[in-house]
Every structure is written in structure tokens, then in C-alpha cells.
Amino acid sequence: MAVTACQGLGFVVSLIGIAGIIAATCMDQWSTQDLYNNPVTAVFNYQGLWRSCVRESSGFTECRGYFTLLGLPAMLQAVRALMIVGIVLGAIGLLVSIFALKCIRIGSMEDSAKANMTLTSGIMFIVSGLCAIAGVSVFANMLVTNFWMSTANMYTGMGGMVQTVQTRYTFGAALFVGWVAGGLTLIGGVMMCIACRGLAPEETNYKAVSYHASGHSVAYKPGGFKASTGFGSNTKNKKIYDGGARTEDEVQSYPSKHDYV
């Protein structure tokens, strides 16, 4: 029961996380700037991975996509790549984990197969979460680095002058959504990996040892108990008494493949 709950919860947490990663990737508010030295109107600029928008105090809002823009920084391209890889891995992980869920029966799929699928999806969720966290962190670092650079960086062109405008910048909402979503996906993946351990116990067959007691020969077989259940053929340690010594193979027992000591 605990295994099923852990697996189900891991799936739900990962699902929420991946939905968050998709949302963060699509959001426009990765970084936000307020334009200070502007004598005309208050300008609020916000930028996403795919487009940049401007909103003025007058209510005017305009967004422009980056598709035609040359010279986008490699860092931005790297962030895009990390987020997309995170989404793709997460989506595949979700697909795999649906079939791996213990509560869903698909044909005669064995528990070992479900365990393997659970582990695979768990690893995918972990990598997906790490990709999202890395992508968001790279962007945040790029933002901080660019704004701590000297604003006295001026250069002249055609007799005119270009300089950096004093702006106040903040991390956009998408960064926080991305961090939280990445964390949730990561946690979900860990939960799936933990659930995998419960789904596939180690199959260890221990050979019983024959003890010869004085007077009566006793074959002593340590019994196993079935994981998470109170049933199975050999749930208690049995002593088998009879007139003569027997080999282990002669002792009647019905071992289960999930029995372990």
C-alpha cells in the first residue's frame, strides 16, 4: 500500500512540476525592468525566452518575438535548450510512469517490469527537474552579471553616443515558477525511485542447512516472509521432525519468488 501511495504521489508531484516547467518556459516575465531616466512616460519592460514586451503607464503594451533578431546571447539559447530538454524528458517520463503505476493493470505485466519503468521515469523526472533548475539559474546569473557590469560602458558612433540607461531590474515571476517546478519534478522523481525499490524486492534464494539433533534428525529451514503481506507458503520458521534425516530437497516447501530473509 505504501509503495502504491509513494508511486502515485511521485507521479502527481512530477506532473505538477512538469506543468510548471512548461508554464515557466512559455512565460514572458523572466526578467523585468523599470526604465528610470525617461521624461515621457513610465516604461515597464519584461522579457521572456521567446519575446520581449513593453508596457507603458498609458496602458500601451507591445510584445516582439526574437525570431528575426540576430546576435541573441549564447546563454539565452542555452537556457532555451535546457528548458526544452527538461520538458521533453519530463513528458516521456510521465508517459512511462503512467504504464508503471501499480494501480493500473496492463495485460500480464510483471512487477519487475513495472519496477524498471518506475525507476526509468524517476530518473527522467530527476534529470528534467535538474535541467529546469539549471536553466532558470543560468538566466538569473546572466541577469545579475549584466546589471552589475559597469554602467559607464559608453562608446561613440557617427559622432553620437551610446550608453547604458539606469534601470531597476528584478527577477521575473517565471524564474520563481521555474525553480519551484524544477524542485517538484526532482522530488517526484526521487519518490518514484524510492517506490521502485518497494516494487521489486531482491530475489535471494537461501539454501537451508540440515541440523542433526541427537535422537531425532531435524531438518531446520528458516522461513521467509512475503514483502508487505501476511501470506505466503512459509511465513513462520518451521521445524520438521521425523524419524530420519532428510535432505533439503526432500523437505516439502513452497517457496515464493518474493520470499526473502
Epitope: V43, Q47, S58, F60, L69, M142, V162, Q163, T164, V165
Partner: nanobody
Framework: EVQLVESGGGLVQPGGSLRLSCAAS????????MGWYRQAPGKQREFVAG???????NYAHSVKERFTISRDNAKNTMYLQMNSLKSEDTAGYYC???????????????WGQGTLVTVSA
């Protein structure tokens, strides 16, 4: 990089009119606000008029009702229609633009080289 080029300056009689133009060129992603500033000999540079991307305008008190600012976003060009010119309007007129550069995630303030307007009889 972004460059601004002003044109339309010259000599005009008091009460006359002139139309200045400012064209932006180069690797432009988006220019948010544009403005005109002027600097008379021996004086500080002062704000004349400004216009936002959305069309909001602002004028210095000394030029209100005489000057009209406009812009064409598609062409990245700004205009200043100057009517009823006075001798105190004589100055170098400089174009200013605040351009968003997504490559550096920063605003760049770009200045033109200026055009001279002389109001004299």
C-alpha cells in the same frame, strides 16, 4: 549597434517653421522612447519634447503649442515640427532614443550627432 541621424536643421527667420527628422538604424530590436534635446552655445543640454512607443508625448513648457512631436514606429523615425520659431530656439538639436537590447538584457541610451537650428532675421 544603433545609430541616430538627425536632419532638417538650418537657418530660418523668426516666426518661421522647420521640420526635424531623426532616423534610427543598425541592429534595432525595439526603441521604446524617443526625444529631442537642445543645447544652445554656453548652456546645458535641455529636454524639448519626447514621445513613447505608444504615442504618449511630453513637452518642455517653453515649446508647448509651438512644437509637435510625432513618430513612425515601423520606420524607427521621429519628427519634430517647429512652428512660430523664436531667436531663443537657436541651438543644436539632438535626437535621443532608449532602445531595448535583449542581447545584454539592458536599455541603451543612444544620442545622435545633432543638427543646428538657427533662428535669425
Amino acid at each position: 549597434e544603433v545609430q541616430l541621424v538627425e536632419s532638417g536643421g538650418g537657418l530660418v527667420q523668426p516666426g518661421g517653421s522647420l521640420r526635424l527628422s531623426c532616423a534610427a538604424s543598425g541592429n534595432i530590436f525595439r526603441i521604446d522612447t524617443m526625444g529631442w534635446y537642445r543645447q544652445a552655445p554656453g548652456k546645458q543640454r535641455e529636454f524639448v519634447a519626447g514621445i513613447s512607443r505608444g504615442g504618449s508625448t511630453n513637452y518642455a513648457h517653453s515649446v508647448k503649442e509651438r512644437f509637435t512631436i510625432s513618430r513612425d514606429n515601423a520606420k524607427n523615425t521621429m519628427y519634430l515640427q517647429m512652428n512660430s520659431l523664436k531667436s531663443e530656439d537657436t541651438a543644436g538639436y539632438y535626437c535621443n532614443a532608449q532602445a531595448w537590447d535583449p542581447g545584454t538584457i539592458r536599455y541603451l541610451e543612444v544620442w545622435g550627432q545633432g543638427t543646428l537650428v538657427t533662428v535669425s532675421a
